[in-house]
């Protein structure tokens, strides 16, 4: 029995619903009473949802899963996962047993966009060329871990004296804090780019220092 799932991971935003597609080819005369369908976590074998003896056996996964009962007879064994959380990320196995059997695993990749970075400067007054300043770029509640890039006003990457920390909150979402230590020129713009590697989403923040005063676009 050929069980088919997408080769690429299913990407779902935190808080949205995701469909884990799974299909099989029913033989002529196939009856739902013969179908044994099990969705489980691939690694732990924890039961997620099942269908047996012609009946949906329900969700065993925080009551956030559902099948498409009207489509099962046509071989659609897809699973709907509601209100996706970071903890849902991983591999799910679709196991189908009729006369023959088959199984296949589909990966769920969870993502959350990062907020527009906020920029802070320390010290933030009486700045002169030659002073060393610390610029902090903060972006919140994204997933997975971000890639952070700094550049100056000419687009030249700034890689030295950068310290980036990422901390997960109780939902598993990351808050990113990246600190750039730089010696001020006569004037200049410093930009921080926070990239979500899954969504290919970039969040930009910048600070421009023009002697006095400073501006934060």
């Amino acid at each position: 029995l050929e069980v088919q799932v997408p080769e690429d991971p299913v990407v779902a935003l935190v808080g949205t619903d995701a469909t884990l597609c799974c299909s099989f080819s029913p033989e002529p005369g196939f009856s739902l009473a013969q179908l044994n369908l099990i969705w489980q976590l691939t690694d732990t074998k924890q039961l997620v949802h099942s269908f047996a003896e012609g009946q949906d056996q329900g969700s065993a996964y925080a009551n956030r899963t559902a099948l498409f009962p009207d489509l099962l007879a046509q071989g659609n064994a897809s699973l709907r996962l509601q209100r996706v959380r970071v903890a849902d990320e991983g591999s799910f196995t679709c196991f189908v047993s009729i006369r023959d059997f088959g199984s296949a695993a589909v990966s769920l990749q969870v993502a959350a966009p990062y907020s527009k970075p906020s920029m802070t400067l320390e010290p933030n007054k009486d700045l002169r060329p030659g002073d060393t300043v610390t610029i902090t770029c903060s972006s919140y509640r994204g997933y997975p871990e971000a890639e952070v890039f700094w550049q100056d006003g000419q687009g030249v990457p700034l890689t030295g004296n950068v310290t980036t920390s990422q901390m997960a909150n109780e939902q598993g979402l990351f808050d990113v804090h990246s600190v750039l230590r730089v010696v001020l020129g006569a004037n200049g713009t410093y930009s921080c780019l926070v990239r979500n590697p899954v969504l290919q989403q970039d969040a930009h923040g910048s600070v421009t220092i023009t002697g006095q005063p400073m501006t934060f676009p």
Partner: antibody, heavy 117, light 108 residues
């Protein structure tokens, strides 16, 4: 008539290998999953392994995982069990059985595997 | 893994009498349970599937009942050819496919 005929059993020493075969006839072999079930002398039945009709999916009992490999050749209507790193506790009659809807509707007569030093 | 426990281990019955064999599952298997008969020196043969459906050619003195976790195989009037070992097997949640330890039905 459905027929399953096992062969390849024998006496081997611990650590050695053996390959069992099961020749099937009387049905469309590729439409059914096939399984191996064993029975140690004087003991009950123990499921060993199963392979889907296409050969694309296989499962094993924990007791043989990593040592035994199930395979099939649908062009020859034959099921195989490659048994490596054999242990004394693998001594048993090995049956091949046709899987249908979850149960085993036809069984071979079995072949005896004895692992002894 | 679902564990199947069969009882009794041995059942002594006179020919013509009724035999009642039990199979209990460690968690629900719905009606996905099969029974097999095995005579000495022979492979097992399918008797009952889906808890209560007789396999092709099985006489009606054999009947299966139960659902969930408790199942019964009843042989209404034992014939001489019925003295054998009987095994139950679940196929609701697998792998692994699991068998009970067997019940031997012997002549009293």
């Amino acid at each position: 008539d459905v027929q399953l005929v096992e062969s390849g059993g024998g006496v081997v020493r611990p650590g050695e290998s053996l390959r069992l075969s099961c020749a099937a006839s009387g049905f469309t072999f590729s439409s059914y999953a096939e399984s191996w079930v064993r029975q140690a002398p004087g003991e009950g039945l123990e499921w060993v392994s199963i392979i889907s009709g296409s050969g694309g999916n296989t499962f094993y009992a924990d007791s043989v995982k990593g040592r035994f490999t199930i395979s099939r050749d649908n062009s020859k209507n034959t099921l195989y069990l490659q048994m490596n790193s054999l242990r004394a506790e693998d001594t048993a009659v090995y049956y091949c059985a046709r899987f249908a809807y979850g149960f085993f509707d036809y069984w071979g007569l079995g072949t005896l595997v004895t692992v002894s030093s | 893994e679902i564990v199947l426990t069969q009882s009794p281990g041995t059942l002594s019955v006179s020919p013509g009498e009724r035999a009642t064999l039990s199979c209990r599952a460690s968690q629900t298997v719905g009606s996905k349970l099969a029974w097999y008969q095995q005579k000495p020196g022979q492979p097992p043969s399918l008797l009952i599937y889906d808890a209560s459906t007789r396999a092709t050619g099985i006489p009606d003195r054999f009947s299966g009942s139960g659902s969930g976790t408790d199942f019964t195989l009843t042989i209404s009037s034992l014939q001489s050819e019925d003295f054998a070992v009987y095994y139950c097997q679940q196929y609701r949640n697998w792998p692994p496919l699991t068998f009970g330890g067997g019940t031997k039905v012997e002549i009293k």
